[in-house]
């Protein structure tokens, strides 16, 4: 799976979309998880409604929401009041039994609020975007991770 980068501004909302084949994943619940380290597990943040037929209902866990358009085949995750610590690698998943199929790998980048003059030294993102592929609502911008780019910040 390629990694898609979504950029949002600190303090604002970021909307992440994960398209999928609606028939292939028919009847399957979806989840949004955070990758813990490059080889680590993906820790569940939020999942869609227990009843697949009600997957369109928005479910929240803290400041993260998930909703699934099961006919159109688009999973949407909203990160409200984006913070620097939200930056990192995530996955959209399709669940079936013990299995979790990756629908999309997502790198969330948090940009400093241009109206906020506080020190932005703690904000991290892997590099300037050479090209922006898709503009999304709620100030989100996505692009595919460029070859050679590292999805995790270097560890000291």
């Amino acid at each position: 799976h390629n990694t898609t980068v979504f950029q949002g501004v600190a303090g604002q909302s970021l909307q992440v979309s994960c398209p999928y084949d609606s028939m292939k994943h028919w009847g399957r619940r979806k989840a949004w998880c955070r990758q813990l380290g490059e080889k680590g597990p993906c820790q569940r943040v939020v999942s869609t409604h227990n009843l697949w037929l009600l997957s369109f209902l928005r479910r929240w866990n803290g400041s993260t929401a998930i909703t699934d358009d099961t006919l159109g085949g688009t999973l949407t995750i909203t990160l409200r009041n984006l913070q620097p610590h939200d930056a990192g690698l995530y996955q959209c998943q399709s669940l079936h039994g013990s299995e979790a199929d990756t629908l999309r790998k997502v790198l969330v980048e948090v940009l400093a609020d241009p109206l906020d003059h506080r020190d932005a030294g703690d904000l991290w993102f892997p590099g300037e975007s050479e090209s922006f592929e898709d503009a999304h609502v709620e100030h989100s911008i996505s692009r595919s991770l460029l070859e050679g780019e590292i999805p995790f910040p270097p560890t000291s």
């Epitope: 619940r29 037929l53 039994g97």
Partner: antibody, heavy 124, light 107 residues
Framework: EVQLVQSGAEVKKPGESLKISCKGS????????IGWVRQMPGKGLEWMGI????????RYSPSFQGQVTISADKSISTAYLQWSSLKASDTAMYYC?????????????????WGQGTTVTVSS | DIQMTQSPSSLSASVGDRVTITCRAS??????LNWYQQKPGKAPKLLIY???SLQSGVPSRFSGSGSGTDFTLTISSLQPEDFATYYC?????????FGGGTKVEIK
């Protein structure tokens, strides 16, 4: 009518290659997973693997991984099971089956439509 | 792989009898359990999916129950056409393994 029609019986020698087919009709072939099941003479059912013809995503049982290849040609609504080098122990009835669509609390699909089966006999 | 153990492996019963077949998984599989019927020389037929949901067109005398590791297929009143072999199958983790089968014979 929704159906899966399999290719006819095969008699082969050990070491020969073989490709059997399963043609779907009466439904959107690219929208359902297709599975293959082996039944050796007088024995039970063994799950071999599944394929999603829409994008050819395939999952194998470890017991059959590397022994067979599952493929599909969505342009002609056909799934395939093939061997590059048959063994006498491959003698069995092979069924293809469609995984249904379920929308309840648990997405356990079940294999709701089955082919008539293809008998494969491998003997020197 | 998840092992599926069916019991009994065979049973003799009469028309009108209530028949119960059990299936045990080697680990919890929630409700990801299907039941099939197979008659000699024929392809299997799906009876029950998701542990307890009756497949369309299957007579209501067939019912399924259970979750976790223990499951049951019940035929409330055995009919002549029900003499066959029954298989359970887990769909919780690849490979989606089958049980060894239970042959229901005429007493």
């Amino acid at each position: 009518e929704v159906q899966l029609v399999q290719s006819g019986a095969e008699v082969k020698k050990p070491g020969e290659s073989l490709k059997i087919s399963c043609k779907g009709s009466g439904y959107s072939f690219t929208s359902y997973w297709i599975g293959w099941v082996r039944q050796m003479p007088g024995k039970g059912l063994e799950w071999m693997g599944i394929i999603y013809p829409g994008d050819s995503d395939t999952r194998y049982s470890p017991s059959f991984q590397g022994q067979v290849t599952i493929s599909a040609d969505k342009s002609i609504s056909t799934a395939y099971l093939q061997w590059s080098s048959l063994k006498a122990s491959d003698t069995a009835m092979y069924y293809c089956a469609r995984l249904g669509h379920y929308s309840g609390t648990v997405s356990s699909y079940g294999m709701d439509v089955w082919g008539q089966g293809t008998t494969v006999t491998v003997s020197s | 792989d998840i092992q599926m153990t069916q019991s009994p492996s065979s049973l003799s019963a009469s028309v009108g009898d209530r028949v119960t077949i059990t299936c045990r998984a080697s680990q919890s599989i929630s409700s990801y359990l299907n039941w099939y019927q197979q008659k000699p020389g024929k392809a299997p037929k799906l009876l029950i999916y998701a542990a307890s949901s009756l497949q369309s067109g299957v007579p209501s005398r067939f019912s399924g129950s259970g979750s976790g590791t223990d499951f049951t297929l019940t035929i409330s009143s055995l009919q002549p056409e029900d003499f066959a072999t029954y298989y359970c199958q887990q769909e919780y983790a690849v490979p989606y393994t089958f049980g060894g089968g239970t042959k229901v014979e005429i007493k």
